[in-house]
């Protein structure tokens, strides 16, 4: 079931979920991709003080970068 994630555990979980995309705790975009990356309460409030699932954690991943054409 869902569990709380804090400190280094939270960072490890984000690295696992986001992979090469990376992640950030900062400003969401105004609209479009990543504009709803994070719930209003913030990742610590959402995942450390309470439990959160992987889908919610993924909202903090950086957007996928389109593949560069040759």
């Amino acid at each position: 079931g869902p569990e709380t994630l804090c400190g280094a555990e939270l960072v490890d979980a984000l690295q696992f979920v986001c992979g090469d995309r990376g992640f950030y705790f900062n400003k969401p975009t105004g609209y479009g991709s990543s504009s709803r990356r994070a719930p209003q309460t913030g990742i610590v409030d959402e995942c450390c003080f309470r439990s959160c699932d992987l889908r919610r954690l993924e909202m903090y991943c950086a957007p996928l970068k389109p593949a560069k054409s040759a």
Epitope: K27, P28, G30, Y31, G32, S33, S34, S35, R36, R37, A38, P39, Q40, G42, M59, C61, P63, L64, P66
Partner: antibody, heavy 117, light 111 residues
Framework: QVQLQQSGAELVRPGSSVKISCKAS????????MNWVKQRPGQGLEWIGQ????????NYYGDFKGKATLTADSSSSTAYMQLSRLTSEDSAVYFC??????????WGQGTSVTVSS | DVVLTQTPLSLPVNIGDEASISCKST???????????LDWYLQKPGQSPQVLIY???NRFSGVPDRFSGSGSGTDFTLKISRVEAEDLGVYYC????????FGAGTKLELK
């Protein structure tokens, strides 16, 4: 609890400007985009634009570029919208609304602007 | 600009009826982050709008389960399984995958 408290109704002259406010409380004001929405009497909702209070970044819908100017003061958790060169077309109720993961989940009560000579 | 076309614009119902509102977008609202940026709002007479459904099909906290959202890409639907008096008002779809826009609104009213 989250609240967005807007300033009171305005009666203004054509050609003038008006600045309305939206005071936020109960959440981290700087970390969420604040949106502004227009509703003319008996009409639908029009998205005007949005501001990120953390750094002042803005996005505007085309029709409102040059008409609306969005600003925010993080120290007082207040967002502002100034409307310039007012005409009768600007007579409307204006709403502020924060947007986050759940969409625009909290709205102000609306500010009525009446443009009349 | 993305245009959202709502149908019908007026929807007369009896209490207890099922109601269905369509919202069609001129562009796909599926974003590269895997989310589809389509929400539904209700504005009751004399009140500020309130969110009902976010990201196509998720009911906002406190919204009764008689409300449901569905769809993908460019075609979306809001359904009310059994209309109650408190549901009367104007329903708007809203997209924020591109520069945000609202649909024109659907007025749910009594026959």
């Amino acid at each position: 609890q989250v609240q967005l408290q807007q300033s009171g109704a305005e009666l203004v002259r054509p050609g003038s400007s008006v600045k309305i406010s939206c005071k936020a409380s109960g959440y981290a004001f700087s970390n969420l985009w604040m949106n502004w929405v227009k509703q003319r009497p008996g009409q639908g909702l029009e998205w005007i634009g949005q501001i990120y209070p953390g750094d002042g970044d803005t996005n505007y819908y085309g029709d409102f570029k040059g008409k609306a100017t969005l600003t925010a003061d993080s120290s007082s958790s207040t967002a502002y919208m100034q409307l310039s060169r007012l005409t009768s077309e600007d007579s409307a109720v204006y709403f502020c609304a924060r947007i986050g993961y759940y969409g625009m989940d909290y709205w102000g009560q609306g500010t009525s602007v009446t443009v009349s000579s | 600009d993305v245009v959202l076309t709502q149908t019908p614009l007026s929807l007369p119902v009896n209490i207890g009826d099922e109601a269905s509102i369509s919202c069609k977008s001129t562009k796909s609202l599926l974003s590269s982050d895997g989310l589809t940026y389509l929400d539904w709002y209700l504005q009751k007479p004399g009140q500020s709008p309130q969110v009902l459904i976010y990201l196509v099909s998720n009911r906002f906290s406190g919204v009764p389960d008689r409300f449901s959202g569905s769809g993908s890409g460019t075609d979306f639907t809001l359904k009310i399984s059994r209309v109650e008096a408190e549901d009367l008002g104007v329903y708007y779809c809203f997209q924020s995958n591109y520069l945000p826009t609202f649909g024109a609104g659907t007025k749910l009213e009594l026959k």
